[in-house]
Interface confidence: low
Amino acid sequence: SLGSLTIAEPAMIAECKTRTEVFEISRRLIDRTNANFLVWPPCVEVQRCSGCCNNRNVQCRPTQVQLRPVQVRKIEIVRKKPIFKKATVTLEDHLACKCETVAAARPVT
Amino acid sequence: SLGSLTIAEPAMIAECKTRTEVFEISRRLIDRTNANFLVWPPCVEVQRCSGCCNNRNVQCRPTQVQLRPVQVRKIEIVRKKPIFKKATVTLEDHLACKCETVAAARPVT
């Protein structure tokens, strides 16, 4: 908008760094062959690289990644009763980020 | 995966609350009639509701919203020179969140 600038603070760039994001645990991560169950919790927090860089030729990319296994509950409904099982989902957290050229291969840690 | 649970911590739900997200300032927000310019900064941080609720009939929604005008730079290249102008973009920050039934209308504050 082209409104009055009187109370507008200068916009600060969202720098390239890790931020907390919400990751939805899809049922396919637990069991691809069966859809008759629920997952608890349905979503968890992960650390992910986000933000923008000084020009379009570079992107905010993770330079260090950590895999984090977490235990979830697989809730099957058998004859109208919940059956609780345990499953492990491996989450990916980004530990460090960098503005890298788009062509550069993503490092694996 | 249903692998070994030895080092798996219990997954904690990503509760419904405000988190810092990255908002890309699209050029359309500044000028819909012209594409021959850049915007600086290209992205900013905003506060947004995210997370999940106890069942599928409810969603994490903002209960309090604040509009925040910020000053950005519109950078036009005119006869090979960068012309720096000011424009105001109004960002939307979520101040408070709640798990609300899907049918409920979103509040305006």
Partner: antibody, heavy 122, light 110 residues
Framework: EVTLRESGPALVKPTQTLTLTCTFS??????????VGWIRQPPGKALEWLAN???????YYNPSLKNRLTISKDTSKNQVVLTMTNMDPVDTATYYC??????????????WGQGTMVTVSS | EIVLTQSPGTLSLSPGERATLSCERS????????VSWYQQKPGQAPRLVIY???QRASGIPDRFSGSGSGTDFTLTISRLEPEDFAVYYC??????????FGGGTKVEIK
């Protein structure tokens, strides 16, 4: 250290052409975003912008004086030349050259010469 | 073409007092460009004081500050020192980088 120095005639007759030279040091007019401008100031009056020349040889002129002004540069000599045709007594002023940058918020003259006084009289 | 109107024409103040100089930008251009301020003492070339509305130029003491947006811009000298008495000019530009100076404000000793 950035310095600029103006040189040219102190006295010009009406209808004649004024030629002023700005010799500078401490920066290069081939550097991206760099420019040199001319500004004048009649005795006891305000500053008036005349012209700019940029690193890529782009030239800008005060619209009200455009048809009388010509600006040029010699990058190897670190010089900028301004010519002003059809001089009139109202053109009597101190003429300054100054460096200008077009970097982000900057469209201002950050370094100035000491100025040269030009009198137009018969 | 933009027009910059400075007020007051003359400001009579004593050392130690606060000086507030105004520069009003009138233009049909809906996009605002940045304003700079210069100080000029008798017999000397102008000196850049403020650029980009509110950025102090190199070597300028922090008693000088610039502010404003839209059409109204202000140069403030929080406590006048003897060396601050001079003429001050605001300057801006338009889309074609046609540069305009204001008419000046003289800050004189009361």
């Amino acid at each position: 250290e950035v310095t600029l120095r103006e040189s040219g005639p102190a006295l010009v007759k009406p209808t004649q052409t004024l030629t002023l030279t700005c010799t500078f040091s401490g920066f290069s007019l081939s550097t991206y975003g760099m420019g040199v401008g001319w500004i004048r100031q009649p005795p006891g009056k305000a500053l008036e912008w005349l012209a700019n020349i940029w690193w890529d040889d782009d030239k800008y002129y005060n619209p009200s004086l455009k048809n009388r002004l010509t600006i040029s540069k010699d990058t190897s000599k670190n010089q900028v030349v301004l010519t002003m045709t059809n001089m009139d007594p109202v053109d009597t002023a101190t003429y300054y050259c100054a460096r200008i940058e077009s970097v982000w918020t900057r469209y201002d003259f950050d370094y100035w010469g000491q100025g040269t006084m030009v009198t137009v009289s018969s | 073409e933009i027009v910059l109107t400075q007020s007051p024409g003359t400001l009579s103040l004593s050392p130690g007092e606060r000086a507030t100089l105004s520069c009003e930008r009138s233009s049909g251009d809906i996009w605002q460009t940045y304003v700079s301020w210069y100080q000029q003492k008798p017999g000397q070339a102008p000196r850049l004081v403020i650029y980009g509305d509110d950025q102090r130029a190199s070597g300028i003491p922090d008693r000088f500050s610039g502010s404003g947006s839209g059409t109204d811009f202000t140069l403030t000298i929080s406590r006048l020192e003897p060396e601050d008495f001079a003429v001050y000019y605001c300057q801006s530009y338009d889309i074609d980088i046609d540069i305009t100076f204001g008419g000046g404000t003289k800050v004189e000793i009361k």
